[in-house]
Amino acid sequence: ARSEDRYRNPKGSACSRIWQSPRFIARKRGFTVKMHCYMNSASGNVSWLWKQEMDENPQQLKLEKGRMEESQNESLATLTIQGIRFEDNGIYFCQQKCNNTSEVYQGCGTELRVMGFSTLAQLKQRNTLKD
């Protein structure tokens, strides 16, 4: 990119318009999942955040090489996670930083629930939730 590209005007407030989908994914261990972030324009880079618990603050997602991949084109950013594990459970947020401002906008989040129970305690918890 040229140096002046970082000084482009955000197109209207396009940078603030981010739609994240889906809102919820439930898949069995080992499956591949994709989550998407749709933007009105490519007004800035997209990064991904993750939190495990509802009341935590999201942290920058550490991409596991070969298993997690992020891609971005004009108006779509995608996070792909292969071979999902229990530790991938949580809420994933896409975040866009406008190229020439300090403004940061965040999607509403995609909750990932990895199915298949590793312990009796998790099975009991799942049954309780169903009840």
Partner: antibody
Framework: QVQLVQSGSELKKPGASVKVSCKAS????????MHWVRQAPGQGLEWMGW????????SYADDFKGRFVFSLDTSVSTAYLQISSLKAEDTAVYYC?????WGQGTLVTVSS | EIVLTQSPATLSLSPGERATLSCKAS??????????MDWYQQKPGQAPRLLIY???NLESGIPARFSGSGSGTDFTLTISSLEPEDFAVYYC?????????FGGGTKVEIK
């Protein structure tokens, strides 16, 4: 080629106002934000703020809120910096710029 | 506000020598894979000239003896072999966060 041409030097009395212009050419004016920088004599560079050339919305650094106003005339691809209630400490060279492109600077001298 | 501290304030060197200028930020100027740190050169009576953008990218038309490195909070501008026209004041600027801020400058003077 891209050019930013600023208005000439100004000598003003304290309390007066001044309007510095920055005429852009060689690119689509409303594509890029315009930023302003102040440099007092013998001092470093101070970023004053910027204006969105598409929407006209200005944003000011804290030290430049109040007496400083950024404006535009997109019909002539020109950005303006207006300073009111001038003080001696406003004496400086004022630059408009975006990315690698800078105006030549406008010296504003405030003296009684 | 991100404060940028440049060192040394003055660097006295001879033509042909290597110049190493430092800029330290009070907090990270990184976002994703980019560092939003630029380096400018300014000579008396002239507007600043952009040399390096996003920490390590050489601006078009700038000689290859200029290079930039660093990420996070620590950045370096290197002039591999000083030419007579390189004696000037150098400023770093962060454009990661408002307000954009400049360092206080490093003057490179002839020894």
């Amino acid at each position: 080629q891209v050019q930013l041409v600023q208005s000439g030097s100004e000598l003003k009395k304290p309390g007066a106002s001044v309007k510095v212009s920055c005429k852009a050419s060689g690119y689509t004016f409303t594509d890029y934000s315009m930023h302003w920088v102040r440099q007092a004599p013998g001092q470093g560079l101070e970023w004053m703020g910027w204006i969105n050339t598409e929407t006209g919305e200005p944003s000011y650094a804290d030290d430049f809120k109040g007496r400083f106003v950024f404006s535009l005339d997109t019909s002539v691809s020109t950005a303006y910096l207006q300073i009111s209630s001038l003080k001696a400490e406003d004496t400086a060279v004022y630059y408009c710029y975006y990315g690698p492109y800078w105006g030549q600077g406008t010296l504003v001298t405030v003296s009684s | 506000e991100i404060v940028l501290t440049q060192s040394p304030a003055t660097l006295s060197l001879s033509p042909g020598e290597r110049a190493t200028l430092s800029c330290k930020a009070s907090q990270s100027v990184d976002h994703d894979v980019d560092s939003y740190m630029d380096w400018y050169q300014q000579k008396p009576g002239q507007a600043p000239r952009l040399l390096i953008y996003s920490a390590s990218n050489l601006e078009s038309g700038i000689p290859a003896r200029f290079s930039g490195s660093g990420s996070g909070t620590d950045f370096t501008l290197t002039i591999s072999s000083l030419e007579p026209e390189d004696f000037a004041v150098y400023y770093c600027q962060q454009i990661n966060e408002y307000p954009y801020t400049f360092g206080g400058g490093t003057k490179v003077e002839i020894k």
